[in-house]
């Protein structure tokens, strides 16, 4: 049974539905939980071959991670498997969907089911209602980031199969007592929440009970607001390169960014034998924009091919948002083509605005 | 969202200078170049020149030269341009534009202009 | 400063396409991938439909599209509508901004 128009549960495992194409959906897992994201084809019609991305890198299908054109699954997630994941096709590369996961410990935030609680005879003759998983109870205050998914979960038992309930702050919770709505799964013992806002914090108390009993448990909501910052560059990246006259190199950017990061390669030059303008503001050439409107990993990365001795130098890579910028810098050197490739071994340096 | 708010109208005499202003909100002021266009009646997109909020350094279009100042005011978000000398011809609606690109950076190749002010009009008449 | 050179005018009908050509010169619009598009309607400020040549801000309809060859940019609008009817302007920045001296498009 469920609440509205919620019809995702499929199979053991409910799915979390593709944000629409160009938004990110924010997604909280519990540790243990199984991750299911689904990513139907825009419009309804014919997708194509696809490919599940996370954090960059192709997924590779195991016993724990399943892979399907339109749905991935991750059994038993644990916290590496938080981070980005996106559907593309795999001719164009175009992102269909895009998800930021977080797996954090129990009792678990997120429109995901493992399917492990579904009420069942439990083959008692009779009895008072009892926790089946209380191990996965034992967090009582979950603080989540505004925007995230939240699901309270009070897996029960007993004979008669035992009815849920739930009040928030003492009071019976429904639907219509917030914007969004809230989705009860009463095989899964569980209410979701989506996209939570600062007036969903709370007590969340979930009562169940049969004719011989009644058991109750309650949550702490705490709703984080999110304090933006600027993008945050992954440490090392960009790193300094040594390479041979004519040969290609890529340096790479790892940003991180609530709001739609902006990112521009630069290249340091000098002009009528300065490398800083009047202020000491060091002079730049923008050698590659990556716009809004895009999340292509490609952006990512600069690639120069068939370098020449003027490639050497410093190159930035400069992401931007609303807030600020935040920069990181690395180093190009050329060898002649006779001299053997050496491994630059000093870090980037690093800039921050 | 980013919001770039400037004076109102003005009605100059030739001779006199104008200070228009531009309050930017939105965004963290001192990350981006504002630069300063205008537009004279009728006429095209002409180029004064740019202040980097951080450092307060200054490029200002050949034909400005001596009579633009550019300023800013870091603690209101606020950039300044003030013409001086006015004649009829300097009639036209000022625009404040941020400049895509860092103010940590001085871009000699590259970048855009992203957004706007809603412009204001400077009026020399005798 | 020398401006870019663009038509003073086109003009299309609805469902057609049109292109607005931009030429400057090899240390300009030739040497580097710089020039930007800009939609102005009368009495309103300019606003940014293409950067970088052919990239296009989140927010602006797929049916402006942007490139270049040579020394010439060109906006390309297809499926034109009434509401693309207004001015525009190209762009390139190299230690100043230059414009191109705008070009008013009708629909008809």
């Known amino acids: 049974e469920s609440l509205g128009t919620e019809q995702r549960v499929v199979g053991r495992a409910a799915e979390v539905p593709g944000p629409e194409p160009g938004q990110q959906e924010q997604l909280v897992f519990g540790s243990g939980d199984a991750v299911e994201l689904s990513c139907p084809p825009p419009g309804g019609g014919p997708m194509g071959p696809t490919v599940w991305v996370k954090d960059g890198t192709g997924l590779v299908p195991s016993e724990r991670v399943l892979v399907g054109p339109q749905r991935l699954q991750v059994l038993n997630a644990s916290h590496e498997d938080s981070g980005a994941y996106s559907c593309r096709q795999r001719l164009t590369q175009r992102v269909l969907c895009h998800f930021s996961v977080r797996v954090t410990d129990a009792p678990s935030s997120g429109d995901d089911e493992d399917g492990e609680d579904e009420a069942e005879d439990t083959g008692v003759d009779t009895g008072a209602p009892y926790w089946t998983r209380p191990e996965r109870m034992d967090k009582k205050l979950l603080a989540v980031p505004a925007a995230n998914t939240v699901r309270f979960r009070c897996p029960a038992a007993g004979n008669p199969t035992p009815s849920i309930s739930w009040l928030k702050n003492g009071r019976e919770f429904r639907g219509e007592h917030r914007i969004g709505g809230i989705k009860l799964r009463h095989q899964q013992w569980s209410l979701v929440m989506e996209s939570v806002v600062p007036s969903d914090r709370g007590n969340y108390t979930c009562v169940v009970e049969n004719k011989f009993g009644s058991i109750r448990q309650t949550y702490t909501l705490d709703v984080l607001e999110r304090s933006p910052h600027r993008p945050i560059l992954q440490a090392g990246l960009p790193a300094n390169q040594t390479a041979v006259l004519g040969s290609d190199v890529e340096f790479h950017c790892k940003v991180y960014s609530d709001a739609q990061p902006h990112i521009q390669w630069l290249k340091h030059v000098e002009v009528n034998g300065s490398k800083v303008g009047p202020d000491g503001t060091p002079y730049v050439t923008v050698l590659k924009t990556a716009g809004a409107n895009t999340t292509d990993k490609e952006l990512e990365v600069l690639s120069l091919h068939n370098v020449t001795f003027e490639d050497a130098g410093e190159y930035t890579c400069l992401a931007g948002n609303s807030i600020g910028f935040s920069h990181h810098s690395a180093w190009l050197v050329v060898l002649p083509a006779e001299e053997e490739l050496v491994e630059a071994d000093e870090a980037g340096s690093v800039y921050a605005g | 969202q980013v919001q770039l708010v400037q004076s109102g109208a003005e009605v100059k005499k030739p001779g006199a200078s104008v200070k228009v202003s531009c309050k930017a909100s939105?965004?963290?002021?001192?990350?981006?170049?504002m630069h300063w266009v205008r537009q004279a009646p009728g006429q095209g997109l002409e180029w004064m020149g740019w202040?980097?909020?951080?450092?307060?350094?200054?490029n200002y279009a050949q034909k400005f030269q001596g009579r633009v100042t550019m300023t800013r005011d870091t603690s209101i978000s606020t950039a300044y341009m003030e013409l001086s000398s006015l004649r009829s011809e300097d009639t036209a609606v000022y625009y404040c534009?941020?400049?895509?690109?860092?103010?940590?950076?001085?871009?000699?190749?590259?970048?855009?202009?992203?957004?706007w002010g809603q412009g204001t009009l400077v009026t020399v008449s005798s | 400063d020398i401006a870019l050179t663009q038509p003073a005018s086109v003009s299309g009908s609805p469902g057609q396409s049109i292109t607005i050509s931009c030429t400057g010169t090899?240390?300009?619009?030739?040497?580097?991938?710089?020039v930007s598009w800009y939609q102005q309607h009368p009495g309103k400020a300019p606003k940014l439909m293409i950067y970088?040549?052919?990239n296009r801000p989140s927010g602006v309809s797929n049916r402006f599209s942007g490139s270049k060859s040579g020394n010439t940019a060109s906006l390309t609008i297809s499926g034109l509508q009434a509401e693309d009817e207004a001015d525009y302007y190209c762009?390139?920045?190299?230690?100043?901004?230059?414009f191109g001296g705008g070009t008013k498009l009708t629909v008809l």
């Open positions: 534009a941020r400049y895509y690109g860092s103010s940590l950076y001085h871009y000699v190749f590259g970048g855009f202009i992203d957004y």
């Open positions: 939105g965004y963290t002021f001192t990350s981006y170049y």
């Open positions: 202040i980097n909020p951080n450092s307060g350094g200054t």
């Open positions: 090899s240390s300009d619009v030739g040497g580097y991938n710089y």
């Open positions: 970088d040549v052919s």
């Open positions: 762009q390139s920045h190299h230690f100043y901004e230059v």
